[in-house]
């Protein structure tokens, strides 16, 4: 067992909120059984930890929100992996169980005397985790103990099912909406034949299922569908890329309902195999506008069109985060490890099992260098605020006219908290309304991003459109410098006049060969030639038949030419 996972970030308070963030990358295939996590993460990890700590500080200093009640937290590392997250969730539950037994006077010392030991406060709710697959596993456990869970990026459609996931809510929309947005983009550019890739796991599987269902209804064909784990080895990604090339040049568009690290795996394989520019990747919000996906592989990613949940940067978070330093930031137990990883240097006096870095960290180092805010920061903060407003409304209802925690809130009843959370609505960090429908989901608003080469060796994401409640808006001129540049992704070209489509046995409806109708036939529909009736002949445009005018011979007409059989 890796010691890094035993690390927990604590902040004291009257009410404790749990949180699961992917502070480290998921274990690689060979380390899964040990549950040994990967490298430390900045956007998805450290920034989210700091967001939780600082957001709680802001809530606690807000006199109008939970007055006389201090919110605290216990943050654990999910490593973007179900087994690790479950292990950490059990720790949350264990704390809650011990606390509730204590409330009921069930905690006794071995000699039978009463215990004076105070255990940790119970967790009233959990923020996160990021991954849908992991969130499902965590929810399966939390709901047994009536602990509400608010997710900030788990978008799987399955999580909308309240019969299965009663205590789950989210400040993001269900993936059914971005699947629709992706299909709308495919339709817009008349791509009728695309390859499909998804990340193995709930997010990718359910998202791709929705994409395929919607595509079929729109007459879009899937050349082939492939799945892969984000932590699959190079060989697996190479094989997948080779399979995708077998559908070129017809299926140039690859719809990827993928986690960011799956996309990165594809880009790396494109580099190894010499396939930059051969595909246009259409990516879901797992990719969005993340630089950790494209770093070092920008050439391979150029042209990519991605879906991003609408969430502007949070200025006040940057103001706080960019001032953090390892010598003063002790409440985040992962911060020193992150600092060393970020700047590839060694901190003086920091215990290092294996001193990976030779140079000592310079005191002038600052997080301002190459800073990129986590694209889902707004959602993380909104999830924390949702919990606070839910608790606030619950306190107002259970403790009228009382500032602080009244007896009716000791211990906090998860069922009542869930009820209160579902009714919560407030203005979010970006000025938008945060509310939950009957499934605990939030409304869907997306930005459409395009990864472009902006100048020599300078690449960036630019906003090229939006999808809001079913309406797609795209700036086509920004995506394609001229109409002729629009990539084609079709199996067969339209047939010429007087030809019909013949779909080969076992082929999808988008793949056909064009066959001309016979001399006496017209095009009945796009798949059928029909012979004109006796006495009629196909029209010039071959869309029907005209009667052949009858010409009668009269006396005086020249005799028709004929040849005798005997004539040689």
């Amino acid at each position: 067992q890796s010691s890094e996972r035993r690390v927990v970030a604590h902040m004291p308070g009257d009410i404790i909120i749990g949180a699961l963030f992917s502070v480290h990358h998921q274990p690689t295939v060979d380390k899964v059984h040990e549950r040994k996590c990967g490298a430390v993460r900045e956007q998805y990890g450290i920034q989210r930890v700091e967001a939780m700590l600082h957001t709680l500080e802001r809530i606690n200093s807000d006199p109008t929100l939970l007055p006389n009640i201090t919110l605290g937290c216990e943050i654990r590392d999910s490593c973007w992996h179900s087994a690790v997250a479950l292990e950490q969730s059990i720790e949350f539950i264990r704390d809650s169980l011990i606390s509730s037994e204590e409330e009921e006077g069930l905690v006794r010392c071995v000699d039978g005397s009463s215990s004076s030991f105070r255990s940790k406060k119970p967790i009233v709710g959990v923020i996160g985790p990021g991954s849908s697959s992991v969130a499902i596993q965590v929810q399966n456990l939390l709901q047994l103990f009536n602990i509400p869970q608010i997710a900030y990026s788990a978008t799987s459609m399955d999580l909308s099912d309240k019969t299965l996931f009663k205590y789950f809510m989210r400040v993001v929309p269900s993936d059914a909406q971005q699947a629709r947005a992706m299909v709308d983009i495919v339709k817009r550019y008349n791509w009728t034949y695309v390859s499909a890739v998804h990340t193995e796991g709930n997010y990718g599987e359910s998202g791709m299922e929705a994409f395929k269902d919607m595509s079929a209804k729109e007459g879009i064909c899937i050349a082939h569908s492939y799945k892969i784990y984000s932590n699959a080895g190079e060989q697996s990604f190479d094989k997948l890329l080779k399979k995708l090339t077998s559908h070129l040049p017809k299926a140039r568009v690859v719809a990827c309902f993928c986690e960011g690290m799956t996309v990165r795996g594809l880009l790396m394989a494109m580099r190894r195999l010499g396939l930059a520019g051969e595909f246009l990747l259409l990516g879901s919000d797992g990719w969005a506008d993340r630089y950790d996906v494209t770093d070092g592989y920008q050439r391979e990613a150029v042209g990519g069109i991605t879906i991003k949940l609408q969430s502007p940067d949070v200025k006040w978070f940057d103001d706080y985060y960019l001032k953090l330093r390892p010598e003063t930031n002790h409440r985040n137990p992962w911060f020193q490890e992150f600092w060393q990883h970020r700047f590839q240097c060694r901190l003086e006096g920091f215990p290092q099992e294996n001193s990976k870095y030779n140079k000592t960290c310079d005191s002038s180092l600052t997080l301002k260098t190459h800073h990129v805010q986590d694209s889902k920061m707004g959602f993380v903060i909104n999830a924390i605020y949702s919990m606070a407003y839910g608790l606030h409304n619950m306190q107002m209802s259970l403790c009228p006219g009382y500032a602080g925690l009244c007896d009716a809130m000791k211990p906090i009843d998860g069922r009542k908290l869930l009820e209160s959370l579902m009714k919560t609505n407030f203005t979010g960090v970006s000025g938008d309304m945060i509310l939950f429908d009957e499934n605990g989901d939030s409304p869907g608003r997306y930005e459409i991003m395009n990864f472009k080469e902006m100048g020599k060796d300078y690449f960036d994401y630019i906003n090229v459109g939006s999808w809001d409640n079913g309406e797609l808006k795209m700036d086509d001129d920004e995506v394609w410098s001229k109409k002729s540049n629009i990539i084609r992704s079709v199996c067969s070209e339209p047939c010429e006049k007087g030809q019909i489509k013949v779909i080969r046995k076992g082929e999808v409806s988008c793949c056909w060969t064009c066959t001309p109708c016979k001399e006496n036939e017209y095009v009945f529909d796009e798949y059928t030639c029909k012979a004109c009736q006796l006495g009629s002949w196909p029209t010039d445009d071959l869309t029907g038949c005209d009667l052949i005018p009858v010409q009668y011979l009269r006396w005086g007409d020249p005799e028709p030419d004929y040849k005798d059989d005997d004539d040689k």
């Epitope: 190079e234 060989q235 080779k242 077998s246 070129l248 040049p249 190894r272 195999l273 010499g274 051969e278």
Partner: antibody
Framework: QSVEESGGRLVTPGTPLTLTCTVS????????MGWVRHVPGKGLEWIGI?????STYYASWAKGRFTISKTSTTVDLKITSPTTEDTATYFC?????????????WGPGTLVTVSS | AYDMTQTPASVSEPVGGTVTIKCQAS??????LSWYQQKPGQPPKLLIY???TLASGVSSRFKGSGSGTEYTLTISDLECDDAAAYYC????????????FGGGTEVVVK
């Protein structure tokens, strides 16, 4: 479906030479085309490949010395400044797919002799 | 780069015998390997692709196997017409064309 090389001849060192591969029975917009050479007494060596999309890749030793381009029915290999080491039989071959892959069919080859 | 090393450089076997040619890649090529036969004065001919798939019109006496970095071509029931040079080729990466072909194996049929 066939491919055939032409343009091989005796040239003096430094005189640019263009070999042409003419294809029939398939479209160059659907298949990648490669150039391979066989130096007498040695094995086969890849020079470069042009994908259906038009992207080109070369062996590191061939970069700058060779250029591959195509029209709708032909693929050209330009030897920019031949040296005596470039004496070989040059083959043009079609990839099984739109990018790099196993190659089939092959042309009969065209002989290039570089000599002063 | 995916460097291909072929052994042996030459082999001699009687008619009816069996020849085994090995090809090793410097790193995994995920079974993207093809085998070619070349007779003097002729272009190479594709025998096998994707490590074990027989090209059309090729005799089933030719068998390809292997995965990862190790691959084998086996020619059984040798015929006089099998006398030729045989080459393996990595079919995985077009951006690494150096040494994509093995050095070749000369097969002599006695």
């Amino acid at each position: 479906q066939s491919v055939e090389e032409s343009g091989g001849r005796l040239v003096t060192p430094g005189t640019p030479l263009t070999l042409t591969c003419t294809v029939s029975g398939f479209s160059l917009s659907r298949y990648a085309m490669g150039w391979v050479r066989h130096v007498p007494g040695k094995g086969l060596e890849w020079i470069g490949i042009i994908y259906a999309s038009g992207s080109t890749y070369y062996a590191s030793w061939a970069k700058g010395r060779f250029t591959i381009s195509k029209t709708s029915t032909t693929v050209d290999l330009k030897i920019t400044s031949p040296t005596t080491e470039d004496t070989a039989t040059y083959f043009c071959a079609r990839s099984r797919t739109a990018t790099y892959d196993a190659v089939d069919p092959w042309g009969p080859g065209t002989l290039v002799t570089v000599s002063s | 780069a995916y460097d291909m090393t072929q052994t042996p450089a030459s082999v001699s076997e009687p008619v009816g015998g069996t020849v085994t040619i090995k090809c090793q890649a410097s790193q995994s090529i995920s079974s993207y390997l093809s085998w070619y036969q070349q007779k003097p004065g002729q272009p190479p001919k594709l025998l096998i692709y994707e490590a074990s798939t027989l090209a059309s019109g090729v005799s089933s006496r030719f068998k390809g196997s292997g995965s990862g970095t190790e691959y084998t071509l086996t020619i059984s029931d040798l015929e006089c017409d099998d006398a030729a040079a045989y080459y393996c080729q990595q079919d995985l990466s077009g951006s690494n064309l150096d040494n994509s072909f093995g050095g070749g194996t000369e097969v002599v049929v006695k």
